[in-house]
């Protein structure tokens, strides 16, 4: 089952995807597409990176993080209800049938007419640090438990806890990575 993320109409949606390059600058090609990951490439490609740069993108889709350090999380600008659906992040790792494929489900909610600051729900993913939510009401600190190194098979399970697109912004600093090499 796909990991689910949420955003409101008019917001920017954030879909996390990470890997750790084997060496600085030793990047792995990545593609993002709308639709579940097929056997090769991504369906309906919206963005692609190569070993140096973002070499293909479409409007409203961009990488906000430092993709040269393996943060290939996708930002979708000013989302509409039509942006709902499954997105594929494919990390094209050298070797035989090594690609990492992640299907992320984006749910777009209608915008609230009178948004009021609301407390984030409990965040139960086990990260060994403190996270401070930002950009949506008063800052609040949540204490999180500890977790050993995250491996490839754990990343999807771990991401299950990141169901709110606003809170998912904090994942970038959390240390959740796929290690290549």
């Amino acid at each position: 089952s796909e990991v689910e993320y949420r955003a409101e109409v008019g917001q920017n949606a954030y879909l996390p995807c990470f890997y750790t390059p084997a060496a600085p600058g030793n990047l792995v090609p990545v593609c993002w597409g709308k639709g579940a990951c097929p056997v090769f490439e991504c369906g309906n490609v919206v963005l692609r990176t190569d070993e140096r740069d973002v070499n293909y993108w479409t409007s409203r889709y961009w990488l906000n993080g430092d993709f040269r350090k393996g943060d290939v999380s996708l930002t979708i600008e000013n989302v509409t209800l039509a942006d709902s659906g499954i997105y594929c992040c494919r990390i094209q790792i050298p070797g035989i049938m090594n690609d990492e494929k992640f299907n992320l489900k984006l749910v777009i909610k209608p915008a609230k007419v009178t948004p009021a600051p609301t407390r984030q729900r409990d965040f139960t993913a086990a990260f060994p640090r403190m996270l401070t939510t930002r950009g949506h009401g008063p800052a609040e600190t949540q204490t999180l438990g500890s977790l050993p190194d995250i491996n490839l098979t754990q990343i999807s399970t771990l991401a299950n806890e990141l169901r709110d697109s606003r809170l998912a912004n904090d994942l970038r600093d959390s240390g959740a990575t796929i290690r290549i090499g």
Epitope: P38, R48, P94
Partner: antibody
């Protein structure tokens, strides 16, 4: 426009290794979005996907052939190649190299080599 | 692996007629289904990808539809050059697989 030119022997002895090369012209084998592939067609029958390689070195093999199969890229020569070991008469087929390019919902195409009829016989 | 069953095996039609080819998958392939045309002595040519998108340079008389397990290729008005063998192929499940083909022949 990218073109593919195949080369390699048309006759291979049983138990030997079938080796074919596909040379890419009119573009770089390092182009993102191109999946350099091998497909075969047994005489009078349908098509069978053998496998593909992406310029990053990401490789996918058909499980039915995986134990005998090697697909590799030589970026310096702008070539990719197929090696199939321990061949039998069942490997007799027309072998095609191909490139699939997927960019977005409005842009996809394929390019095929001319095909090489490979007969396995002593 | 995913089995693709094409029907009919042979379709006998005249130029100008409408051709409807069917492809059924043994399990869902989402919309990741392609159609190819092959003429004798030639390599296959991609016509339709992802169920309904025409590949670059393919005439508008070719159209594809369907999702999940049932797909259709329609040639709205057959031209003389359209008589060939047509294959469907899925790229949803590894390995990619092809159907056994439908031959469209002149009646």
């Amino acid at each position: 426009q990218v073109q593919l030119q195949q080369s390699g022997p048309g006759l291979v002895k049983p138990s030997q290794t079938l080796s074919l090369t596909c040379t890419v012209s009119g573009g770089s084998i390092n182009s993102g979005g191109h999946y350099w592939s091998w497909i075969r067609q047994h005489p009078g029958r349908g098509l069978e996907w053998i496998g593909y390689i992406y310029y990053s070195g990401s490789i996918y093999y058909n499980p039915s052939l995986k134990s005998r199969l090697t697909i590799s890229v030589d970026t310096s020569k702008n070539q990719f190649s197929l090696k199939l070991s321990s061949v039998t008469a069942a490997d007799t087929a027309v072998y095609y190299c191909a490139s699939y390019y997927y960019a977005s919902s409005g842009d996809a195409f394929d390019i095929w080599g001319q095909g090489t009829m490979v007969t396995v016989s002593s | 692996e995913t089995t693709l069953t094409q029907s009919p095996a042979t379709l006998s039609l005249s130029p100008g007629e409408r051709a409807t080819l069917s492809c059924r998958a043994s399990q869902s392939v989402s919309s990741y289904l392609a159609w190819y045309q092959q003429k004798p002595g030639q390599a296959p040519r991609l016509l339709i990808y992802d169920a309904s998108n025409r590949a670059t340079g393919i005439p508008a008389r070719f159209s594809g539809s369907g999702s999940g397990t049932d797909f259709t290729l329609t040639i709205s008005s057959l031209e003389p050059e359209d008589f060939a063998v047509y294959y469907c192929q899925q790229r949803s499940n590894w390995p990619p697989t092809f159907g056994q083909g439908t031959k469209v022949e002149i009646k």
